[in-house]
Interface confidence: low
């Protein structure tokens, strides 16, 4: 409903707004202030999103999917603000929104293109499948389809298996890489171009260590400065692989500076932690401590995996008793 009076038609301008799944956004629209303001927001020029006239909302014909999700800035309408506050955007909300504003002297049309992105924090996992070792970069929910790249010793590699499952609103992606028998370092990057968000996973294998029973072992874990920002929340987990599955020995949360230790012979050096060095000691080794030890430093932007192989051999005393 627009006032039947002489008015000037102002041509349309268009703006792109990027939203993140489940977040609130604002679709901007402004106009030359005037009296008898009428505001209609429409989706794809057909679904009614929000209507306002005669000084109040009129939502009787609002499309049900927008119920309780939209509002205007009522104290700002008289200043020329017809922007729409939009709660909890979903991928189904993507598209073109048109704002029609009429006053006593003009009608203006503003178009806003809404693009919605998803980027749940990816993970890099190390898995044993029979006799093979795999690195898997995966992201549970991402939209639009991301760009995934692998590097071996800082050189891009073309082998890039993508296992993709698409749901109604996003993709779930696994990218496995067979690294059986390799001592190289690997890096996987997942990029969401819409949200301009990049995540990197890095995997480094350290030389194997041979230790005698009852000795102790020190295993290093220092983040690579290129990725690591101590100001950002991160988590460090040390785990040991036993018959194909990892059991957690200890973890550290930067947000609370809490250390939780599940293995009594495990120790962390608090002073080193303060210098972002997460190397650990395992005391009083026994034969069953042989295996792979994994340090995982993870934040929203990266996962750094460092793996050590430890071989514990019987001490001379033990051997002479047998």
């Amino acid at each position: 409903i627009f006032p039947l009076a002489f008015f000037i038609y102002v041509p349309m301008n268009e703006q792109i707004v990027i939203g993140r799944l489940d977040e609130d956004i604002i679709l901007p629209s402004s106009f030359e202030r005037g009296s008898e303001v009428v505001i209609h927001w429409k989706y794809q020029d057909s679904y009614k999103v929000h209507s306002y006239y005669k000084g109040s909302d009129h939502l009787e014909s609002q499309d049900p999917r927008y119920a309780n999700r939209t509002s205007l800035f009522y104290n700002e309408i008289q200043n020329g603000n017809a922007s729409l506050f939009f709660r909890r955007v979903s991928l189904l909300d993507e598209g073109i929104y048109t704002c029609y504003v009429g006053t006593a002297i003009q009608v203006i049309t503003n178009k806003v293109v809404l693009k919605v992105g998803v980027f749940l924090t990816p993970v890099m996992k190390y898995e044993k499948r029979n006799t093979n070792s795999f690195l898997i970069c995966s992201v549970l929910s991402v939209y639009p389809r991301p760009i995934i790249t692998w590097k071996m010793d800082n050189t891009p590699i073309s082998e890039n298996n993508m296992e993709e499952t698409g749901s109604l609103d996003s993709f779930s992606i696994n990218s496995p890489l067979n690294i059986t028998g390799s001592n190289s370092s690997y890096e996987c990057t997942i990029e969401n171009s819409l949200l301009k968000q990049t995540w990197t996973g890095r995997w480094t294998m350290k030389d194997g260590l041979h230790k005698m029973q009852s000795e102790h072992v020190s295993l290093s874990c220092q983040p690579v400065n290129d990725y690591f920002s101590p100001n950002q929340d991160f988590k460090v987990t040390w785990s040991r692989m036993k018959s194909g599955t990892f059991s957690v020995l200890a973890y550290y949360l930067s947000s609370s500076q809490n250390t939780i230790i599940n293995e009594s012979r495990f120790s962390w050096n608090k002073e080193l932690i303060n210098q972002s060095d997460f190397s650990m000691n395992l005391m009083d080794l026994n034969l069953s401590d042989s295996g792979e030890y994994l340090c995982n430093i993870s934040s929203d932007e990266y996962t750094l995996l460092t793996i050590h192989t430890v071989h514990v051999e019987p001490s001379q005393e033990t051997a002479s008793h047998n």
Epitope: I18, G19, R20, E23, D24, I25, I26, F73, Y74, N75, E76, F85, R87, G117, L195
Partner: nanobody, 115 residues
Framework: DVQLQESGGGLVQPGGSLRLSCAAS????????MGWHRQAPGKQRELVAL???????NYADSVKGRFTISRDNAGNTMYLQMNTLKPEDTAVYYC?????????WGQGTQVTVSS
């Protein structure tokens, strides 16, 4: 009562930089979307940049690539880093914060770009 306090405005030469800050307080709700608007003398107030609670940023075409909006982890302080400033960026810059129950405005801080 919600209060927004801008700071960091001033006089700067063309090509220079300024960093505006906005501290928000007094809301029972979290600030879903925060933003910067500006109003030059004799002109309509215009949107400069918006940032959502998760850090997703949107910019007016006129400032893309020059201005960067950010907010702290607690979500109550917002910044606008303005680089390569031009005389046409001269305006009063207003901080806005949106909660589920309304939009709030600061008093504004003057930015003047002149040689």
């Amino acid at each position: 009562d919600v209060q927004l306090q801008e700071s960091g405005g001033g006089l700067v030469q063309p090509g220079g930089s300024l960093r505006l800050s906005c501290a928000a307080s007094g809301s029972r709700f979290s600030f879903n979307v925060m933003g910067w608007h500006r109003q030059a003398p004799g002109k309509q107030r215009e949107l400069v940049a918006l940032i959502s609670s998760g850090g997703t940023a949107n910019y007016a075409d006129s400032v893309k690539g020059r201005f960067t909006i950010s907010r702290d982890n607690a979500g109550n302080t917002m910044y606008l880093q303005m680089n390569t400033l031009k005389p046409e960026d001269t305006a009063v810059y207003y901080c806005t914060a949106t909660t589920p129950v309304g939009q709030y405005w600061g008093q504004g801080t003057q930015v003047t770009v002149s040689s």
